[in-house]
């Protein structure tokens, strides 16, 4: 038995489990998912059995190999995978562990403004990103750019502080998790902050 | 100093295959998007298609799809397209790009290596 | 896809002109544009992203503007080294697309 192996896999997509045995004599060979049976192949009779229907055409195993694909993931595909290997000139069966975490291609970030401030003509509010849907594992990173600076702030909340006759700042909130990358509209600073400008001491949403 | 080296080019026969190599080197391979680019002779830019860090996500130009395959070993620090089907018109210089900071935009490119399909 | 149009395809100039090149993308892609300078016999070098942004070491007679779909690099004063194709790229949708160059030559 080796060590746990992670794969990655996009919803959609397909990801292969590989497997290499020394085994000389298999009689056969279980995949599980989450403790429930998978797939069984007899190498012998050239037999698979595919547990439950609606995985029949997702499961394949390429080059004639023990290998497994599994194709058109889905989120709930993300879980713990074991396989066995039986032979009878072993005591005990050869087993390999995965994990499969199973993301979500990302759509556009969105971007929303908390309490705004204008003091002494700088407009001072948080803008926060977020994935609509609720996505895990998102790491999010803001781009702040203009003449004065091209910076990157991680986190979904950025602080901005902007003073008006100031040159105009754009910011763009970048979203990625393992397997996609997107990023949200930009937002400039001198709309973002006109709200506030006739009122030096107005607070709003 | 960050490089990336391509290599593999050559001439080939239509109909042929052929697989490039990009070395890569003076950064941490394994936590960029890679993306392949070629130029035909005279010609513009021609996104190809990029794979994400862990192999799990491949985009590709829709027209090129069904021929080329672009795969990577983080292990070997390679990134590789394997072309199948060439012609006449897949003759070009083909690049491997990094993009800055693992946005969209590419700041490291490698030399290019010269595919020819010719009879 | 999203088609790039870069005019004029190719043009010249004298030394210490200024040098506009307009790129045109077919739909919306706010500000999701890269240009690039391609020297005779060389490879690419990013010079601009997100439609305005420099990049590093990048002199500061490049510049660029635009969103949407009408974006412009402007050179404020043409130097000799400056002579290449440039191509912008918008990254907004794939398969991310590039414009078919402009050439600049010195009169």
């Known amino acids: 038995s080796g060590p746990v192996k992670e794969l990655v896999g996009s919803v959609g997509g397909a990801v292969t489990f590989p497997l290499k045995s020394k085994v000389k004599q298999v009689d056969s060979i279980v995949w599980t998912f989450n403790t429930t049976p998978l797939v069984t192949i007899q190498p012998e009779g050239g037999t698979i059995i595919v547990t439950q229907n609606r995985n029949r055409e997702r499961v394949d195993f390429p080059d004639g190999g023990y290998s497994l694909k599994l194709s058109k993931l889905k989120k709930n595909d993300s879980g713990i995978y074991y396989v066995g290997i039986y032979s009878s000139s072993l005591q005990q069966p050869s087993t390999q562990e995965y994990v499969l975490h199973v993301y979500e291609h990302l759509s556009k970030p969105k971007v929303t403004m908390g309490l705004q401030s204008n003091k002494n003509g700088t407009c001072v509010t948080n803008l926060t990103c977020c994935m609509e849907h609720g996505e895990e594992d998102v790491i999010y990173t803001w781009k702040a750019l203009g003449q004065a600076a091209n910076e990157s702030h991680n986190g979904s909340i950025l602080p901005i502080s902007w003073r008006w006759g100031e040159s105009d700042m754009t910011f763009i909130c970048v979203a990625r998790n393992p397997v996609s990358r997107n990023f949200s509209s930009p937002i400039l600073a001198r709309k973002l902050c006109e709200g506030a400008a006739d009122d030096p001491d107005s607070s709003m949403v | 100093e960050v490089q990336l080296v391509e290599s593999g080019g050559g001439l080939v026969q239509p109909g042929g295959s052929l697989r490039l190599s990009c070395a890569a080197s003076g950064f941490d391979f394994s936590r960029y998007w890679m993306s392949w680019v070629r130029q035909a002779p005279g010609k513009g830019l021609e996104w190809i298609g990029e794979?994400?860090?862990?192999?799990?996500?491949?985009n590709y130009t829709p027209s090129l799809k069904d021929k080329f395959i672009i795969s990577r070993d983080n292990a070997k620090n390679s990134l590789y397209l394997q072309m199948n089907s060439l012609r006449a018109e897949d003759t070009a210089v083909y690049y491997c790009a990094r993009p800055d900071g693992n946005y969209w935009y590419f700041d490291v490119w490698g030399q290019g290596t010269l595919v020819t399909v010719s009879s | 896809d999203i088609q790039m149009t870069q005019s004029p395809s190719s043009l010249s100039a004298s030394v210490g002109d200024r040098v506009t090149i307009t790129c045109k993308a077919s739909?919306?892609?706010?500000?999701?544009v890269a240009w690039y300078q391609q020297k005779p016999g060389k490879v690419p070098k990013l010079l601009i992203y997100w439609a305005s942004t420099r990049h590093t070491g990048v002199p500061d007679r490049f510049s660029g503007s635009g969103s949407g779909t009408d974006f412009t690099l402007t050179i404020s004063s043409l130097q000799p080294e400056d002579v290449a194709t440039y191509y912008c790229q918008q990254y907004s949708s794939y398969p991310y697309t590039f414009g078919q160059g402009t050439k600049v030559e010195i009169k």
């Open positions: 794979i994400n860090p862990d192999s799990s996500t491949i």
């Open positions: 739909q919306d892609v706010g500000i999701a």
